[in-house]
């Protein structure tokens, strides 16, 4: 059974992930972002189901494409270089979902824009955090 300290650690990691995703979304939605039109043409894949930490595998598999999209944006829109930002997110996601269990992600048929994709995972983080608090 999860201890209160492990639950607290999970909560903090989810909050960190949530802030990173919100920062990316804010940077993309910046009205000065000249690459937004092109960024919105990138197709992202959404999970059929995202209710547990293991489902973060679906986010992890989209972090490569996410990094490529962020490479299009002006660096001043973000505090970190895309490579460093994605690297940080990968570490958090790996700690949250674990590396031992190999979960195969199932994707929804419909693709999403980067904005829809980020909003989906922001909602996921908020949902899990609310169950922990």
């Amino acid at each position: 059974a999860p201890t209160s300290s492990s639950t607290k650690k999970t909560q903090l990691q989810l909050e960190h992930l949530l802030l990173d995703l919100q920062m990316i979304l804010n940077g993309i939605n910046n009205y000065k972002n000249p690459k937004l039109t092109r960024m919105l043409t990138f197709k992202f894949y959404m999970p059929k189901k995202a209710t547990e930490l293991k489902h973060l595998q679906c986010l992890e598999e989209e972090l490569g494409p996410l990094e490529e999209v962020l490479n299009l944006a002006q660096s001043k829109n973000f505090h970190l270089r895309p490579r460093d930002l994605i690297s940080n997110i990968r570490v958090i996601v790996l700690e949250l979902k674990g590396s031992e269990t190999t979960f195969m992600c199932e994707y929804a048929d419909e693709t999403a824009t980067i904005v829809e994709f980020l909003n989906r995972w922001i909602t996921f983080c908020q949902s899990i955090i609310s169950t922990l608090t």
């Epitope: 894949y45 595998q57 994707y107």
Partner: antibody, heavy 123, light 107 residues
């Protein structure tokens, strides 16, 4: 169906420069990140680098930095790979290949390949 | 750089047999791994992407699996046209790296 057609074989002297082309047909080049991979005779595959033709941003493998230049001409849907200061170890078949984030998940991998260009470096 | 180690270097089997090719990553790469088949004088051909997904037009006898940083390409029943060199590739981070290849030859 997307097709990549590369320029013909080249024979170069050590110290020279070679420039290989890769023409995309069946789609516009700006839909793809154009990558270059090489294969020395009887050896494995080695990633050289890539270009995003839409904004000309490039990424190169450390081994090739300073010697390789990847460019793209969107008006002709053609990518180029130029390798300078050639040495005998650069004798290889050079392939162009693609990645795109606009279509299916499968096309995020090296799904389309050129036929390869043999570059021979010999004195 | 991420190193991919393929084994065995050469695999000698007969048509109809099952082939199991291994690729081990030097660090965690999630499912960012693909498999390619290459025949002499030809460009590589994508077989498997995202560790387990079958590329379009590839026969169902090919399958991919993953356990941690160990990846496996399985050919359930070898056909004569399957004898070739197979490479794994990681897309987790640049520089993208390939395994050294496994040559599948007729016994």
């Amino acid at each position: 169906q997307v097709q990549l057609v590369q320029s013909g074989a080249e024979v170069k002297k050590p110290g020279a420069t070679v420039k290989i082309s890769c023409k995309v047909s069946g789609d516009t080049i700006t839909a793809y990140y154009m990558h270059w991979v090489r294969q020395a005779p009887g050896q494995g595959l080695e990633w050289i680098g890539r270009i995003d033709p839409d904004d000309d941003s490039t990424k190169y493998a450390e081994n090739f930095k300073g010697r390789v230049t990847i460019t793209a001409d969107t008006s002709t849907d053609t990518a180029y790979m130029e390798l300078s200061s050639l040495r005998s170890e650069d004798t290889a078949v050079y392939y162009c290949t693609t990645i795109t984030f606009y279509y299916t998940r499968e096309l995020r991998w090296f799904a389309y390949w050129g036929q390869g260009t043999l570059v021979t470096v010999s004195s | 750089d991420i190193v991919l180690t393929q084994s065995p270097a050469t695999l000698s089997l007969s048509p109809g047999e099952r082939a199991t090719l291994s690729c081990q990553a030097s660090q965690y790469i999630s499912n960012y791994l693909s498999w390619y088949q290459q025949k002499p004088g030809q460009a590589p051909r994508l077989l498997i992407y995202s560790a387990t997904s079958l590329a379009s037009g590839i026969p169902a006898r090919f399958s991919g699996s993953r356990s941690g940083t160990d990846f496996t390409l399985t050919i359930s029943s070898l056909e004569p046209e399957d004898f070739a060199v197979y490479y794994c590739l990681q897309h987790y981070s640049t520089p993208y790296t390939f395994g050294q290849g496994t040559k599948l030859e007729i016994k």
